[in-house]
């Protein structure tokens, strides 16, 4: 009879993170009497993944009832595949011995790649926001993906940025691997309702890219433009002095009225009117009684944004 | 000795969901001896949530140690809250009775209302794609928040929207809310890489407002244009016509060519040139030996583009 | 025809040593192990040892270790038991069975046993 | 060692019965089981390997279970051929032992 030998019948089987993948095994006789096992690796550190006769291995079944006297078919299936289980599989069969079985033969093992998605891009901006006609850097990152290659692009509210750089990590082989890309973005006014998007293509995604987004009203400053006018008197002996604080982004701001360089009145913007490319308004006013003044008035409208130095704009107000 | 009164001191309690409520309930008196329970809603109906004699709750803890002898304080935490905790709770004095312990007076109840946050907006298209210049529809979904005040906006490429239609259900009073927006989106020709966004706001997002996008590209439809043209000969008795099928998306697009209204030849267009705006360009040539034809070949190039009714563009080959 | 034929009766005085042999034939007889059972009368079944047929590697009972050897001879496709200094409690019918199992022992071939009797 | 019980150590029966034998393991055996009948004079049969695998040509009627420490043989429907000594054997590991047995007599 011919001696036994051990048919790995596929030199490599590539499965998607979560599947389960079928590794092929089948001896060609049924002696000498004793058990098969499968390993992940070779020589002295390989892994046991299957004992046919003893432990738990929740993860694998056997295609073939294995206590059947006649089994050929040592096939099993892992369930639940993770980048962390590629390797090189071997399907080992042992002799019967004392004290221990005694490895008999191997078959010359399947290689299982593991398709993995990369994780959800997650696209970050500056740590300091920067105002138009600045550059700005957004990096997107995402991991755990594999076989390696990868496509990314960048956008910004749907055209295609070209001033971008992409690392894919590790250089070399790897279960899995990373991606880092930097992309630098010129801000505009009207960026505000502006978004970047990181897309990635992937052979695991079937076509359908993986997206990360990042609002540019994270990464903006627009500093406010200052208009002070005076209004038609309501009443003899007062002025009204209006301060017009416009398309400044974000929020934060407090204004000061200053009559001939000494604070009048501090105020913090709350209601505010918001424009349609994001930016608000806001508008302050000043009552000035006139009759406590004899001579002109220079009335400064001060107002610092979002933390930064203080503008101002100042209107002399002519006492007649 | 005053008789006991049952003091709830905070009429109202608002959680955010996930984190623990409590609920505070004090004795003005030690007598009548008897245990305390706390009940949610009042009536025939009402649901015990903690009895201090007996039963099993594992999401109460008690503030303080019921077991001492002198305690007045009978403030419960409720952990991992969820809307569906929401209601009024009421603190009970029970007296000692046979066979059971009888109510003698309960609190004035206390309104627990849980602010959860949104679900993550889910943005769906249509379920056919339209080509540019036609209007489609976009939702937006979100479920599970509490209070019902919500707004909700709609951003094409960080631009605006203002054709939509909001709804929050239900109308009237919930332990959740759920919101459903349909937004009309006009294509544009350049809208493969653009984006529709949906933007919510609510007061348990600080702020920090929820997005969910659809990408246009699932939406749209941008029909070929076609070309076709004459080369210069390659070699005597043979004549090179291109057809250059430009500007379409998505990819599935096949292509007949006909001599005289006889198919010549059918493909499948496969290696595709990306344009910068997401469409794609593709280019079939036909060689036509001109021996073969005494009189002029009219050559037509038939495109069928995503499974659409198939658009056709002629030449006329002059046989010299 | 598989089967594993036996030695004849054999009658020992205490003291003395008793060989039985198995003949095996109709399989290929490297393939498989040969454990030898014994039965005393009136009694259940006591496995008494292993061996090997491929490699000649052995495993036997504590209470019999010194005093039991197998051996096989591939040539004959013949094991063999060897007990050594019997005792009137070794009188038994000897079973040698062939043991099939791949990844635990069972037998599905059976002799059909050798009665020894120790006897002064 | 690993200790084998079995019950009942004899059961008395008619034909058309239906049978049942225990077996328990003193620790965990797997499924590394098997089940002999026995007729006076005769070697061992083997009826049942690895818990509840027929053996071939045994019929159908016998059948068995069990993992871990504690396996069962039924008998479906008794014949005058079954009257006989059954023997469980664990062959998890060496050394290999066998239960009492149970002696299945005529009623």
């Known amino acids: 009879e011919d001696e036994l030998q051990v048919i790995q019948p596929e030199k490599s089987v590539s499965v998607a993170a979560g599947e389960s993948a079928t590794l092929c095994c089948a001896m060609t006789s049924l002696i000498p009497v004793g058990p098969i096992m499968w390993f992940r690796g070779a020589g002295a550190g390989r892994e046991l993944i299957y004992n046919q006769k003893e432990g738990h291995f929740p993860r694998v079944t056997t295609v073939s009832e294995l206590t059947k006297r006649n089994n050929l078919d040592f096939s099993i299936s892992i369930s639940n595949i993770t980048p962390a289980d590629a390797g090189t599989y071997y399907c080992v069969k042992f002799r019967k011995g004392s004290p221990d079985d005694v490895e008999f033969k191997s078959g010359a093992g399947t290689e299982l790649s593991v398709r993995a998605k990369p994780s959800a891009p997650v696209v970050s901006g500056p740590a300091v926001r920067a105002t138009p006609e600045h550059t700005v850097s957004f990096t997107c990152e995402s991991h755990g993906f594999s076989p390696r290659d990868i496509t990314l692009k960048w956008f910004k509210n749907g055209n295609e940025l070209s001033d971008f750089q992409t690392n894919v990590d590790p250089a070399g082989d790897s279960v899995s691997y990373s991606i880092h890309s930097t992309a630098r973005v010129v801000l505009t006014r009207g960026d505000v309702h502006s978004q970047v998007i990181c897309e990635m293509a992937h052979i695991t995604l079937q076509g359908d890219p993986l997206r990360g987004t990042a609002n540019l009203s994270e990464a903006i400053r627009v500093p406010p433009t200052l208009e002070v006018t005076q209004q038609p008197m309501r009443a003899e002996n007062q002025a009204n002095v209006t301060c017009q604080v416009s398309n400044f982004y974000p929020r934060g701001l407090q204004l000061t009225w200053l009559e001939n360089g000494n604070v009048s009145r501090t105020e913090t913007a709350s209601t505010l009117i918001e424009n349609k490319d994001g930016t608000y308004n806001w508008m302050s006013w000043l009552l000035v009684n006139t009759c406590a003044h004899r001579d002109d008035v220079v009335l400064t409208c001060q107002v610092e944004h979002d933390g930064q130095q203080a503008v101002s704009k100042s209107y002399a107000l002519e006492i007649s | 000795e005053d008789e006991l009164q049952v003091i709830q001191p905070e009429k109202s309690v608002s959680v955010a969901a996930g984190e623990s409520a409590t609920l505070c309930c004090a004795m003005t008196s030690l007598i009548p001896v008897g245990p305390i329970m706390w009940f949610r809603g009042a009536g025939a109906g009402r649901e015990l949530i903690y009895n201090q004699k007996e039963g099993h709750f594992p999401r109460v803890t008690t503030v303080s140690e019921l077991t001492k002898r002198n305690n007045l304080d009978f403030s419960i935490s409720i952990s991992n809250i969820t809307p569906a905790d929401a209601g009024t709770y009421y603190c009970v004095k029970f007296r000692k009775g046979s066979p059971d312990d009888v109510e003698f007076k309960s609190g004035a109840g206390t309104e627990l209302s849980v602010r959860a946050k949104p679900s993550a907006p889910v943005v769906s298209g249509p379920a056919v794609r339209a080509t540019p210049e036609h209007t489609v529809s976009f939702t937006c979904e979100s479920h599970g928040f509490s209070p019902r005040d919500i707004t909700l906006k709609w951003f094409k490429n960080g631009n605006e929207l203002s054709d939509f239609q909001t709804n929050v259900d239900p109308a009237g009073d919930s332990v959740s809310y759920s919101i459903h927006s349909t937004a009309r989106v006009v294509l544009t020709r350049g809208d493969v890489h653009s984006q529709v966004i949906c933007e919510m706001a609510h007061i348990t997002l600080q702020g920090d407002p929820l997005r969910g996008t659809a990408n246009l590209s699932e939406a749209i439809r941008v029909p070929p244009t076609l070309e076709v043209t004459q080369q210069p000969m390659r070699a005597e008795n043979q004549a090179n016509v291109t057809c250059q099928v430009s500007n379409f998306y998505p990819r599935g697009l096949q292509l007949t060519w006909l001599e005289n209204g006889n198919v010549s030849r059918t493909e499948t267009a496969s290696t595709l040139i990306e344009n910068k705006d997401g469409t794609y360009n593709w280019m079939s040539w036909l060689l036509v030996n001109t021996c073969a034809h005494r009189d002029d070949v009219v050559l037509t190039c038939q495109v069928e583009h995503d499974g659409q009714q198939a658009v056709s563009k002629s030449y006329a080959l002059e046989i010299s | 025809q598989v089967q594993l034929v036996q030695s004849g009766a054999e009658v020992k005085k205490p003291g003395a040593s008793v060989k039985v042999s198995c003949k095996a034939s109709g399989y290929t007889f490297h393939g498989y192990g040969i454990s030898w059972v014994r039965q005393a009368p009136g009694q259940g079944l006591e496995w008494m040892g292993w061996i090997s047929a491929y490699s000649g590697e052995t495993n036997y009972a504590q209470k019999l270790q010194g005093r039991v050897t197998m051996t096989t001879d591939t040539s004959t496709s013949t094991a063999y038991m060897e007990l050594r200094s019997l005792r009137s409690d070794d009188t038994a019918v000897y079973y040698c069975?062939?043991?099939?199992?791949?990844?635990?022992?069972?037998?599905?071939?059976w002799g059909r046993g050798t009665l020894v009797t120790v006897s002064s | 060692d690993i200790q084998m019980t079995q019950s009942p150590s004899s059961v008395s029966a008619s034909v058309g019965d239906r049978v049942t034998i225990t077996c328990r393991a003193s620790q965990g055996i797997s499924s590394w089981l098997a089940w002999y009948q026995q007729k006076p004079g005769k070697a061992p049969k083997l009826l049942i390997y690895?818990?509840?695998n027929l053996q071939s040509g045994v019929p159908s009627r016998f059948s068995g279970s069990g993992s871990g420490t504690d396996f069962t043989l039924t008998i479906s429907s008794l014949q005058p051929e079954d009257f006989a000594t059954y023997y469980c054997q664990q062959g998890a590991s060496f050394p290999i032992t066998f239960g009492g047995g149970t002696k299945v007599e005529i009623k």
């Open positions: 690895a818990a509840s």
């Open positions: 069975a062939r043991e099939a199992g791949s990844s635990w022992y069972d037998f599905d071939l």
